[in-house]
Amino acid sequence: YDFTNCDFQKIEADYLRTISKDLITYMSGTKSTDFNNTVSCSNRPHCLTEIQSLTFNPTPRCASLAKEMFARKTKATLALWCPGYSETQINATQAMKKRRKRKVTTNKCLEQVSQLLGLWRRFIRTLLKKQ
């Protein structure tokens, strides 16, 4: 999905109002410095692409993030403010259901959510100096 035509201001507002709090709750008891940055993004559409990938694509180390509250709210936000997003997700959801569930390593999920927080922070930040 191409996130270029999303309403970034609305997505940012949703993130600050709800999604961020759920991510921080998930990470409670963990310092942000416990994990180094292993993923980045270079503009708002790119950030949303990487956020979607980390949130909804199961990995061998962390298979279950899509069921978390922050993931559900992320999905709802993208469906609301990115034209045509929900249609593109129907096939992806059906494909996901066919995958076998793997055992989750909690620490690896914490690491993945830490990366998600970093991506969201890049998405909402007012940029560096422009010279």
Partner: antibody, heavy 122, light 108 residues
Framework: QMQLVESGGGVVQPGRSLRLSCAAS????????MHWVRQAPGKGLEWVAV????????HYADSVKGRFTITRDNSKNTLNLQMNSLRAEDTAVYYC???????????????WGQGTMVTVSS | SYVLTQPPSVSVAPGQTARITCGGN??????VHWYQQKPGQAPVLVVY???DRPSWIPERFSGSNSGNTATLTISRGEAGDEADYYC???????????FGGGTKLTVL
């Protein structure tokens, strides 16, 4: 852990070519801008080239423009530097480094490789 | 192209504060990054975006940037801080990375 490992250095005669590689691991390579930086013996750091996270755009230092080519393969997590028409002044340790980018701004180089030595001598 | 100027060397007594400067035209409008390099090793990022510090760098390292000068401050200097320090910016107007010439820090 996050790692960059350079290879391909060696001794080469002036006018000849050499290809350096940098293998990335432990992070999502395709989301970072990647640089080559060199350091001549006893001298300071000199930036050589950068390639955008997507490979769409490339920038070179004037000293290597037209002779060096930076490329990346995001499917293999590798960065390359093809060096042609080598000169004695290209003798240096060559480092690859990663940097987050935002739009057309490259941020700090937060991970560096250990370097590979290139000696241009007849 | 853009030029960054650093003093070739700076000395500090153990436990004292070292300040390494980096000069450039209107440097305060650029984001300045600082690297530490010990002999035979690769550079290590110690301060980015003028004053931010990677999680693995001690709080003794700090940075500031305004006007035409950026400063890397190392408080309570230790023997292990002896190294070359480089400032760096991304020059958007020319799409080039620019490094300062480097400063050798000696802990007396």
């Amino acid at each position: 852990q996050m790692q960059l490992v350079e290879s391909g250095g060696g001794v080469v005669q002036p006018g000849r070519s050499l290809r350096l590689s940098c293998a990335a691991s432990g992070f999502t390579f395709r989301t970072y801008g990647m640089h080559w930086v060199r350091q001549a013996p006893g001298k300071g750091l000199e930036w050589v080239a950068v390639i955008w996270y997507s490979g769409a755009y490339i920038h070179y230092a004037d000293s290597v423009k037209g002779r060096f080519t930076i490329t990346r393969d995001n499917s293999k997590n590798t960065l390359n530097l093809q060096m042609n028409s080598l000169r004695a002044e290209d003798t240096a340790v060559y480092y690859c480094s990663r940097s987050p980018q935002w739009e057309d701004i490259f941020e700090a180089m937060d991970i560096w490789g250990q370097g590979t030595m290139v000696t241009v001598s007849s | 192209s853009y030029v960054l100027t650093q003093p070739p060397s700076v000395s500090v007594a153990p436990g004292q504060t070292a300040r390494i400067t980096c000069g450039g035209n209107n440097l305060g409008s650029y984001s300045v990054h600082w690297y530490q390099q010990k002999p035979g090793q690769a550079p290590v990022l110690v301060v980015y975006d003028d004053s931010d510090r990677p999680s693995w760098i001690p709080e003794r390292f700090s940075g500031s940037n305004s006007g035409n000068t950026a400063t890397l401050t190392i408080s309570r200097g230790e023997a292990g801080d002896e190294a070359d320090y480089y400032c760096q910016v991304w020059d958007m107007s020319s799409s080039l990375v620019v490094f300062g010439g480097g400063t050798k820090l000696t802990v007396l």
